[in-house]
């Protein structure tokens, strides 16, 4: 045998070159058949009507094929026939890739709650062989599974993701990302999540700076209310008590004038939107006007949200004594 | 020149043989496939059968398949057709044809000779 | 078994255009070969593949070919021209080679 060919793989629409190659030449002929057996090339004579098949060299040793715009339907083995005697035959297989179709990322809630496990589903249509898919959450990757179906050769993937959502997550891309022999480079579609969560409640003392209250001061709260809707409601109680007469309720802010150490107590911040509620309180001590220079002290902000239980961490600005740690039922 | 000659025609018995042969001159006969055509009185042409120039591959018609076989003799530049079991259909004037590409495009054509088959 | 068709005859003046016409299965795929035969001579190639004029052929003489029809065209037709012409393809995917039943043609002088 000393008729030899090459397998050739090409992606779809692309151009295929088939060659027959001679090593012993004796001036026998050369024909190359396609994989219904039609002559394509007859030494350097094309009988067959496709013109999609060209020739690129045809000598004793070599005849050379090109076949431009590669289908499908083009894939399986071309014969190459040398006219001695007796007769010899080689075959050379054409494999057709073929790049996904189509890429699409479906989602099956536009707006998710935190918490919630949502489906995500991936396809990517048409391709051969079977498209790979992966999943990212962000630069995180996930892991779905995947469904394969057959049509005629060609292969449609879905793959399925099952998310559980947090409020980090809001914002954050769903990346679909297929590998392919046929892809070069990145081949991905995305979707952002969007992920609704109830109110993050944080407390800031504005005034006095430098944290420590004191009779016939003024205090100055502001309550940050983060959440997804932003929160429509941010309301100022004290905890057990009234609010005091002398204070000033001005959207997310809390003013109150002159303290006196009646005003002590747990002051709270509520903010509500349609996930759910959440709090922060911040406990008020109100101490004596100084006399001499003022003991160094500091107040931090505490903040909650909601659970069954939440545990609240109060810092008290009284000299000397250590914050404790309390249980608060809502 | 280019010249195919063919010889061997006469008139024949059905169920009798008969071997026609065909002298190539002026080409390099080992490099083309050759083929036998007939043409009945008054009809059309009829491709009966062909050989690869080296030999090793021959093709037939199926109205004279089992019947007739083609070879040919690449020292003497000679094709032959071995016809048995003649019958009065196989009656014509055979001609022998050089494929310019195979049997695509028979470039080069013979005078023909008379094959007679009749009681 | 395939076979390729071909109309009985067709007259033309001399200098007119006339047109032969091929039909046939096998024709989807390969381009035919077209011969002329005059009386009492063998065939003689004059068209073939999807443009070849041997040499010595006047260029009058064309083909084409589309779906399952082939046509052989003589562009101002001469009075040699009038002589039988067939069509000639492979059969399919066997290796088998057909005719069609050939189309006289007729000059008028």
């Known amino acids: 045998q000393n008729l030899f060919t090459k397998d050739v793989t090409v992606i779809e629409g692309e151009v295929a070159t088939i060659s027959c190659q001679v090593n012993k030449s004796d001036d026998s002929v050369i024909q190359l058949l396609n994989p219904n057996r039609q002559t394509i090339y007859f030494r350097d004579f094309r009988p067959l009507k496709d013109s999609r098949f060209q020739l690129l060299n045809f000598s004793s040793s070599e005849l050379k094929v090109s076949l431009t715009n590669v289908s499908i339907s083009d894939e399986g083995r071309y014969f190459c026939q040398l006219y001695t005697d007796p007769p010899q035959e080689s075959y050379t297989t054409i494999t057709v890739l073929v790049p996904p179709r189509n890429l699409m990322i479906d989602i099956q809630r536009d707006t998710a709650v935190e918490g919630e496990e949502i489906e995500v589903n991936c396809t990517a249509m048409a391709s051969k062989p079977a498209t790979t898919i992966r999943w990212f959450k962000g630069n995180t990757e996930l892991k779905g599974k995947s469904e394969v179906e057959e049509w005629s050769d060609m292969y449609t993937v879905t793959s399925q993701l099952m998310l559980k959502v947090h409020k980090e997550d809001d914002g954050v891309p769903v990346i679909c990302q297929v590998e392919h022999p046929a892809v070069t480079g990145n081949l991905q579609t995305q979707r952002y999540l969007e992920v609704q969560y109830k109110p993050q409640v944080h407390i800031q003392m504005t005034y006095p700076l430098q944290g420590l209250t004191r009779e016939g001061d003024a205090l100055e709260l502001t309550c940050e209310a983060i959440g997804k809707p932003q929160p429509v409601m941010v309301t100022w109680v004290r905890v057990d008590d009234e609010m005091p007469q002398h204070a000033v309720l001005s959207g997310p802010n809390l003013f109150i004038n002159n303290l006196n150490k009646t005003d002590n107590g747990t002051y709270r911040c509520e903010a509500s939107n349609i996930v759910g509620k959440a709090h922060s309180d911040y406990m008020l001590y109100v101490y004596d006007p100084p006399t001499t220079i003022p003991p160094p002290t500091t107040t931090t902000t505490t903040t909650t949200t909601t659970t069954t239980t939440i545990l609240t961490i109060i810092t008290d600005s009284r000299a000397g004594e250590e914050g404790s740690i309390r249980a608060v039922d809502h | 020149e280019v010249q195919l000659v063919e010889s061997g025609g006469g008139l024949v018995q059905p169920g009798g043989s008969l071997r026609l042969s065909c002298a190539a001159s002026g080409f390099t006969f080992r490099s083309y496939t050759m083929s036998w055509v007939r043409q009945a009185p008054g009809k059309g042409l009829e491709w009966v059968s062909g050989?690869?120039?080296?030999?090793?591959?021959?093709y037939y018609a199926d109205s004279v398949k089992g019947r007739f076989t083609i070879s040919r003799d690449n020292s003497n530049n000679t094709l032959y057709l071995q016809m048995h079991s003649l019958r009065a259909e196989d009656t014509a004037l055979y001609y022998c044809?050089?494929?310019?590409?195979?049997?695509?495009?028979?470039?080069?054509w013979g005078q023909g000779t008379t094959v007679t088959v009749s009681r | 078994s395939s076979e390729l068709t071909q109309d009985p005859a067709v007259s033309v003046a001399s200098g007119q255009t006339v047109r032969i016409t091929c039909q046939g299965d096998?024709?989807?795929?390969?381009?035919p070969s077209w011969y002329q035969q005059k009386p009492r001579q063998a065939p003689v190639l004059v068209f073939f593949g999807e443009n070849n004029r041997p040499s010595g052929i006047p260029d009058r003489f064309s083909g084409s070919a589309s779906g399952n029809t082939a046509s052989l065209t003589i562009a101002g037709a001469q009075a040699e021209d009038d002589a039988d012409y067939y069509c000639s393809s492979r059969d399919g995917n066997d290796d088998r080679w057909l005719f069609g039943g050939g189309t006289k043609v007729t000059v008028l002088g």
């Open positions: 044809a050089r494929g310019l590409y195979g049997l695509y495009a028979m470039d080069v």
């Open positions: 050989i690869s120039g080296s030999g090793g591959s021959t």
């Open positions: 096998s024709l989807r795929h390969y381009y």
